[in-house]
Interface confidence: medium
């Protein structure tokens, strides 16, 4: 499934974000605009749009460049520059801008209901307008095989500039050099060549204390094809939000400081350093080694499908879930299911631009994974894929066009955390992290944002299952994994994100950070919010009228446990519907290289696998955490 979040058209120019993260290659950008009966804007067209109020905080393709149109200076958007900010080195995946010649010459915020020029295909494409309306259609618009089947869960986004970089202005355009650590797959490559499957395994816990585990995995690129065609609709929300990256690193992540590059970085880096890896799409390079994005994965289809647990479910955001995966990134690819976002409005649709850029919340979880690498998860993609960033990207409203849908905003209120998993460096075994993130709420909801921030609660999950079967097998790990999440307001992490980007190359750097997104509603982040804290609600129940569901959040206190501390906090559906997150048959690749297909049925609410104890296991061993009573 692919979610395309689009903005209003300004003089025909609009921004399109795919799956909540930078996951569009140049070739896909051209195909995407073509599907919208548009073309990549020229610089002149972009300048025209800028002149009538178009600005974002997201890098996107235009003809010949990757830019961010900025009207108002913002330190986290285009390095505080204004004008059409040009990223000089654009070797990665970004969002895209499109130009529709038939659009009104001024601002046009009518809803786009379809991709007029999409061709027949198996992909569920959801167009999310800034007002929150979602239009779904089946089809395909991508033609480049590499866009379609990225094989490596490349961190496409991985590339990012370091915070130290500065942009230089030239000729009225701002040229920003974005250093990319990992070249992302050539946008041109056909054939799926993304190779890695990232699989963050997710552990979901229901509020009832039953732990449900879902190993969500990155879909193997090809298997591939079959996966491509999996209907993601059925997969729904994985309510997972918090993620701990235990990427083998002991350090806790440092906060992510907004940096000039954040616009990109956020997506791009997750900072994982890894050696080389992929968007992860998407998805989405083959190694996890690079800083894979949390879910990135993949890129492209996979991306979207992948991890989206609930991307479309605003509610899910609310539910925080811990994703713990010990997975040798290399091996598992299960990609359990594509969660279909369609069903719900994005919490916030993107236009998270700014906020996106700025990863603020630095609440990091103190998770100490057994391994030594740390990964940074920038929240942005946090939810990957389709999610639309509900928590993450809410654009602060820097973008004039980006206003979040109301539904989304409201939903926000209650999303305490989001997590994301980032694959770790290539062979590191712990790649997922727990990345609690506060959800930005709509401006009006800010208060909600912090909820209970002061109280730090934590749930310590003790894996009951064989440690070796833990989420996605800790191939490298031998001992039991006890995880703790330390989340508390008090944790102030250094927000400096120095190093984050730079560390991309270093597999050991894994910073977990949850960056806060701005409120969706568009306002810039509220300085008052405690960005760093994750919002864990104490027994907070939020009702989502639109879904008629209510979710109970379990208080999480941070419990710090020794070196493995990964805490999983999961707030699940009070109904325990977490299980529904996975469904559908999926082929998963295991480290062994073999693939097996798991069948999950949405109908039973569990995605196959043993359900005892409420734990679902899907393709891939998953550790079942127990929540102490």
């Amino acid at each position: 499934q692919i979610d395309l979040n689009i903005t209003c058209r300004f003089a025909g120019v609009f921004h399109v974000e795919k799956n909540g993260r930078y996951s569009i290659s140049r070739t896909e950008a051209a195909d995407l605009c073509k599907a919208f009966n548009s073309t990549l804007p020229t610089m002149a067209q972009m300048e025209k749009a800028l002149s009538i109020g178009f600005e974002t905080c997201r890098y996107g393709f235009i003809e010949g460049h990757v830019v961010i149109p900025r009207i108002h200076p913002n330190s986290i958007c285009a390095a505080n520059n204004t004008g059409v900010y040009i990223l000089t080195s654009n070797t990665s995946q970004y969002d895209t801008y499109c130009f529709n010649a038939s659009a009104p010459p001024e601002e046009d915020c009518t809803s786009v209901t379809d991709l007029p020029n999409a061709f027949d295909g198996p992909i569920t494409i959801t167009i999310v307008n800034r007002d929150g309306t979602r239009y779904v259609q089946k089809g395909e618009y991508r033609t480049n095989p590499e866009d379609i089947y990225p094989s490596n869960p490349t961190d496409d986004d991985v590339s990012s500039g370091s915070s130290s970089e500065r942009s230089s202005t030239s000729g009225g355009y701002i040229f920003y050099t974005f250093s990319t650590v990992h070249p992302i797959p050539d946008e041109d490559s056909p054939w799926i060549t993304d190779s890695t499957d990232r699989i963050p395994a997710t552990t979901l816990m229901s509020t009832s204390a039953t732990a449900t585990e879902t190993a969500t995995k990155r879909q193997e690129t090809w298997d591939w094809f079959s996966w491509l065609f999996l209907p993601s609709e059925s997969k729904n929300h994985l309510h997972t939000t918090t993620q701990m990256a235990g990427t083998s690193s002991n350090t806790i992540s440092a906060g992510w400081e907004p940096n000039e590059e954040n616009e990109d970085e956020r997506d791009r880096h997750l900072s994982f350093s890894g050696s080389g890896i992929d968007d992860d799409e998407d998805f989405i390079s083959s190694t996890i080694s690079t800083t894979p994005r949390a879910f990135d994965h993949t890129k492209q289809n996979q991306d979207w499908t992948q991890w989206n647990p609930s991307h479309s479910n605003p509610e899910v955001l609310l539910q925080t879930t811990t994703r713990m995966t010990d997975v040798d990134r290399n091996g598992t690819t299960a990609y359990e299911g594509n969660w279909n976002p369609e069903a719900h409005p994005p919490l916030i649709h993107h236009e998270h631009h700014e906020e996106e850029e700025t990863p603020h919340s630095t609440s990091t979880i103190q998770a100490t994974p057994s391994s030594t690498t740390e990964e940074t998860a920038t929240q942005k993609e946090q939810w990957f894929g389709n999610r639309w960033h509900e928590g993450y990207r809410q654009t602060p409203k820097e973008d004039s066009h980006s206003t979040t849908g109301t539904a989304a905003a409201s939903a926000h209120t209650s999303h305490p955390m989001q997590g994301r998993t980032t694959p770790s460096p290539e062979d590191s075994s712990w790649t997922d992290f727990f990345n609690p993130i506060s959800h930005p709420m709509g401006r009006g909801h800010q208060a909600g944002r912090r909820m209970d921030m002061d109280s730090s609660h934590s749930i310590t999950l003790q894996p009951t299952a064989n440690p070796n079967t833990g989420l996605v097998e800790d191939l490298d790990r031998t001992g039991p994994l006890s995880m703790t999440t330390q989340q508390s307001n008090s944790q102030s992490f250094s927000t400096s994100h120095e190093g984050l980007e730079e560390d991309k190359d270093h597999p050991t750097t894994s910073t977990l950070t949850s960056s806060n997104r701005n409120d969706v509603t568009g306002g810039r982040r509220d300085p008052n919010h405690s960005e760093g804290s994750t919002t864990l609600l104490e027994g907070y129940t939020s009702h989502y009228p639109h879904t008629k569901e209510s979710r109970t959040f379990i208080p999480v206190t941070s419990a710090k446990t020794g070196s493995f501390g990964v805490t999983a906090v999961t707030v699940g559906d009070s109904n325990s519907n977490v299980n529904r997150s996975l469904s559908g048959d999926q082929d998963t690749f295991h480290p062994s290289g073999g693939s097996h297909t798991t069948h999950g049925s949405e109908s039973d609410g569990h995605s196959h696998g043993s359900q005892e104890g409420g734990a679902n296991t899907t393709s891939g061993p998953i550790r079942t955490p127990q929540i102490p009573e």
């Epitope: 590499e146 869960p153 190779s195 690129t221």
Partner: antibody, heavy 117, light 108 residues
Amino acid sequence: QVQLVQSGAEVKKPGASVKVSCKASGYTFTNYAMHWVRQAPGQRLEWMGWINTGNGNTKYSQKFQGRVTITRDTSASTAYMELSSLRSEDTAVYYCARFYSGSGSPWGQGTLVTVSS
Amino acid sequence: EIVLTQSPGTLSLSPGERATLSCRASQSVSSSYLAWYQQKPGQAPRLLIYGASSRATGIPDRFSGSGSGTDFTLTISRLEPEDFAVYYCQQYGSSPLTFGGGTKVEIK
């Protein structure tokens, strides 16, 4: 510039195994899958399988399943394709390929493997 | 698996002429996931077209692809001397990836 350089020609006896290497340069090896395709004399190209260079996962064509093993050494940015139980009909030029449309040489130059008793 | 049949097997033309190569699939190729390659003697194949009609980087615009479903066509509007080679179509919409038998474009 993307470049894939393969190991030299090999002559093997039936029943033996051959391992062909493919060293990648000009891009981040682990970011892209590596495919292996062979072409017997006068025959069409046959896709053998691919490896997710990032995590080592592989996918093989049913035709070669059980006889082919594709691996990679990320530190050396090299992919390997080993074909066992060689038969005379396995005589072909084996190519590693990064199927992509960018510039450069996404295919290796080919390695001729001759299976002869 | 999807079997791709190319025709004609050999096409004899002169430089400057238009070449039309056909590729028929035994079953519909998902989302037009069809590529065309050019291969010259002793060389590895070179990607020309992907997605049925998108030219790969650096490919001259005299090469164009079209078609969908089961019938695809590669057209070389004006043959240049360097265009005489064997052309293969390949589908990458389902596993295993398969190639056509090739069409040899030779100088008449």
